[in-house]
């Protein structure tokens, strides 16, 4: 007899989710010597415990604490790059600028990047059919709560100058409802963080506007200043050239504005 199953509005758990998490954990711990001590089977146990058998609209940050504890990692606090709606370029940047880190360059971020997961109340099954959508169903779903938890911790760890990459092609360059706008901005610690430097990435080749004057950027500046953190902003007019110059800073064309 087929059991009635809750239909959610979002896509179901990524296929082979446990295997993917385990495989990513093994790969990460092999590449990063400082995380070699991590037992990936225990990491998966903590991950499964956070959401399986629990109602997927009733997940709390507390559910993820065992996983957070196992994934505790020290990254240089002055080398943190946050991003909003421009993940690919942020990741391309840290792949070149190896001493800077996005959340997805940490173990926990790497494990969950681009994955979806949820369980069902009172069964030890993973729901591969559907998972709650943040807008249409509920915000306290396993994926959203995970990213809120790790993003908060990542922002809390930051110090000195924190950089954030923002997408200048979007109508809201700074979006208060993004993870950056709703979580990370509010968890930067003023006693540790001196400056938030925004890099606004231009989309069009002929776009020479100063997007640092955009009203949403001014709104970000206001929020940050009220938190006693300095704010600075730079336009990145040519992201392709920007990446190229990160790779080869001595290139003669890299002295001009990018």
């Amino acid at each position: 007899v087929p059991r009635w199953r809750q239909q959610w509005s979002g896509p179901g758990t990524t296929k082979r989710f446990p295997e993917t998490v385990l495989a990513r954990c093994v790969k990460y711990t092999e590449i990063h010597p400082e995380m070699r001590h991590v037992d990936c089977q225990s990491v998966w146990d903590a991950f499964k415990g956070a959401f399986i058998s629990k109602h997927p609209c009733n997940i709390t940050e507390e559910d993820y604490q065992p996983l957070m504890k196992l994934g505790t990692q020290t990254v240089p606090c002055n080398k943190i790059l946050l991003w909003s709606r421009i993940k690919d370029l942020a990741h391309q940047f840290t792949q070149v600028q190896r001493d800077m880190f996005t959340l997805e360059d940490t173990l926990l971020g790497y494990l969950a990047d681009d994955l979806t997961w949820c369980g069902e109340f009172n069964t030890s099954k993973i729901n591969y059919q559907s998972c709650p959508d943040w807008r249409k169903d509920c915000s306290n779903n396993p994926v959203s709560v995970f990213w809120k938890t790790v993003s908060r911790r990542f922002a809390e760890a930051a110090c000195d100058v924190v950089h954030v990459m923002l997408n200048g092609s979007r109508s809201k360059i700074f979006d208060k409802n993004s993870t950056f706008g709703s979580v990370e901005v509010h968890n930067l610690q003023p006693e540790k963080v001196q400056t938030l430097e925004a890099w606004v990435i231009h989309g069009g080749r002929e776009d020479s506007r100063d997007l640092c004057q955009d009203p949403t950027i001014k709104e970000l500046e206001s929020i940050i200043s009220k938190r006693n953190i300095q704010f600075s902003c730079k336009n990145i007019y040519r992201p392709d050239k920007f990446l190229q110059c990160v790779k080869n800073p001595e290139d003669s064309s890299c002295t001009s504005e990018i």
Epitope: P18, E19, L22, A23, V26, D39, C40, Q41, S42, W44, D45, A46, K48, G49, I52, S53, P66, N122, T123, S124, K125, I126
Partner: antibody
Framework: QVQLVQSGAEVKKPGSSVKVSCKAS????????FSWVRQAPGQGLEWMGR????????NSAQKFQGRVTITADKSTSTAYMELSSLRSEDTAVYYC?????????????WGQGTLVTVSS | DIQMTQSPSSLSASVGDRVTITCRAS??????LAWYQQKPEKAPKSLIY???SLQSGVPSRFSGSGSGTDFTLTISSLQPEDFATYYC?????????FGQGTKVEIK
């Protein structure tokens, strides 16, 4: 029909090593994990460690770390448990047991057990 | 490590009796609990997983309940083939740990 067939009984001297095998048939070997559980005469069950063949990773109980090596050979669908520096207290029946990689369920299939006797 | 404590360690019962075995975890394990039956000279056999789910092929007289730290295995009407030793086991975290066992004997 899933079957886990273990190697035969062993008699070993203190200080030596023993390697027990567990050959799986009737299922996709790489879709599962294999644990080793031992039972001393008249005693309860004691988990030793677990291997995930598809990833080639294993973990073990702290009590056995440094003495136990758990491996798997995907080509022959066989899991292995090697215990070194044997002492008389290691005399036990050693079982292999299967569970799913995600560890969402119990040990659903067990080998028949291998008696290892450690005696001088 | 999570300690699993079973009680009683042994009990005597008659065919047809209702038998209850309890298992307590030293810390919360949600519903990550399995029950096994073991007969002399045989490998253990899975009865219950996820605290209350019946393993395929196991008679419905076996049932499990509980979550967190306190769990129960119930045999509603003991049959001759049920005389054996029963173990609980947590699979919430490593190392996996078993209870010390409950031997069910014929009265």
């Amino acid at each position: 029909q899933v079957q886990l067939v273990q190697s035969g009984a062993e008699v070993k001297k203190p200080g030596s090593s023993v390697k027990v095998s567990c050959k799986a048939s009737g299922g996709t070997f790489s879709s599962y994990a294999f644990s080793w559980v031992r039972q001393a005469p008249g005693q309860g069950l004691e988990w030793m460690g677990r291997v995930i063949p598809f990833l080639g990773i294993a973990n073990s109980a702290q009590k056995f770390q440094g003495r136990v090596t758990i491996t798997a050979d995907k080509s022959t669908s066989t899991a292995y448990m090697e215990l070194s520096s044997l002492r008389s207290e290691d005399t036990a029946v050693y079982y292999c047991a299967r569970d799913d990689i995600a560890a969402l369920g119990p040990f659903d299939y067990w080998g028949q057990g291998t008696l290892v006797t450690v005696s001088s | 490590d999570i300690q699993m404590t079973q009680s009683p360690s042994s009990l005597s019962a008659s065919v047809g009796d209702r038998v209850t075995i309890t298992c307590r975890a030293s810390q919360g394990i949600s519903s990550w609990l399995a029950w096994y039956q073991q007969k002399p000279e045989k490998a253990p056999k899975s009865l219950i997983y996820a605290a209350s789910s019946l393993q395929s092929g196991v008679p419905s007289r076996f049932s499990g309940s509980g979550s967190g730290t306190d769990f129960t295995l119930t045999i509603s009407s003991l049959q001759p083939e049920d005389f054996a030793t029963y173990y609980c086991q947590q699979y919430n975290s490593y190392p996996r740990t078993f209870g010390q066992g409950t031997k069910v004997e014929i009265k």
